[in-house]
């Protein structure tokens, strides 16, 4: 489903797919990521992916699609 | 073909419990977001609550601290534990399939499992 | 809390056009879906994200979303039609759907 990325970055993973376990990188506590759609105004805020909303901090993320990367999934990856 | 089956309903009195569940069928359970969907006798849908895929809760105000929803994603299935019932609890309860994430819209439900509570 | 407001009916005459409203304030800042539901039966999805239809959802089901009002629009409207169709947003984290509206098809 490609990767995953947020705005602002901060550390810990998320979920690049549904299904994938969305827990921080800390190793003291593991906190599970919870997403749900981002709303409307952030319809065209992923370029090439699909927008999540982080619950927990009301900041949208994006899944982005093969072959592209960064915050907004506006980065090609020349690698793929 | 994609498919969710409720089960569970029935008569129960006021302030006692019971468990619903929904068996899915058809697709990769564990990766939707679920909810339970409520409607009384001749009355409008009411959203009960919702389950994300790994794990976020959220519920309606009126059945937060009595209702509890988790899933069973071995088993392809859904519950609902519902504790302190009371007369408005009356309704047929519908299981339903959130499109990828919370916050999209129910493309997919079961027929619905009647619970009654009277004394 | 976020409430949708339905009319409880609307009637239409067969092969006309029936417009069913749902208010909301700001609505036009959400998506808005649309729920078919015949008696005895489970709602149906018919139309999602304001205007998209489901695949096998006839085109005579539109919807659009400005303002303060989504509106369900049934085109041609045939016996079959006859139902209650429920609007349904997102808000800080819960569904909230509308009260409902019954159509019916006259003639």
């Known amino acids: 489903d490609g990767n995953t990325t947020r705005t602002p970055e901060t550390n810990g993973s998320l979920c690049g797919a549904p299904g994938e376990n969305c827990t921080g990188t800390t190793p003291r506590q593991k906190v599970k990521t919870h997403f749900s759609r981002c709303p409307k105004q952030y319809k065209h805020y992923c370029i090439h992916g699909r927008c999540r909303f982080v619950v927990d901090e009301q900041t949208p993320s994006c899944i982005c699609e093969k072959g592209y990367f960064g915050a907004r999934c506006e980065r090609v990856d020349l690698f793929y | 073909q994609v498919q969710l089956l409720e089960s569970g309903g029935g008569l129960v009195q006021p302030g006692g419990s019971l468990r619903l569940s929904c068996a899915a069928s058809?697709?990769?359970?564990?990766?939707?977001?679920m909810s339970w969907v409520r409607q009384a006798p001749g009355k409008g849908l009411e959203w009960v609550s919702g389950?994300?895929?790994?794990?976020?809760?959220t519920y309606t105000d009126s059945v937060k601290g009595r209702f509890t929803i988790s899933r069973d994603n071995s088993k392809n299935t859904l519950y609902l534990q519902m504790n302190s019932l009371r007369a408005e609890d009356t309704a047929v309860y519908y299981c339903?399939?959130?499109?990828?994430?919370?916050?999209?819209?129910?493309?997919?439900w079961g027929q619905g499992t009647l619970v009654t509570v009277s004394s | 809390s976020y409430e949708l407001t339905q009319p409880l009916s609307v009637s239409v005459a067969l092969g006309q056009t029936a417009r069913i409203t749902c208010s909301g304030d700001?609505?036009?800042?959400?998506?808005v879906h649309w729920y078919q539901q015949k008696p005895g039966q489970a709602p149906v999805l018919v139309i999602y994200?304001?205007?998209d239809r489901p695949s096998g959802i006839p085109e005579r089901f539109s919807g659009s979303n400005s303002g303060n009002t989504a509106t369900l629009t049934i085109s041609r409207a045939q016996a079959g039609d006859e139902a209650d169709y429920y609007c349904?947003?997102?808000?800080?984290?819960?569904?909230?759907f509308g009260g409902g509206t019954k159509l019916t098809v006259l003639g």
């Open positions: 339903a399939r959130d499109y990828l994430d919370f916050g999209y819209y129910f493309d997919v």
């Open positions: 058809g697709f990769t359970f564990s990766s939707y977001a």
């Open positions: 389950l994300g895929h790994v794990g976020y809760t």
């Open positions: 700001k609505i036009g800042k959400k998506y």
């Open positions: 994200d304001d205007s």
């Open positions: 349904q947003a997102w808000d800080m984290q819960s569904v909230v």
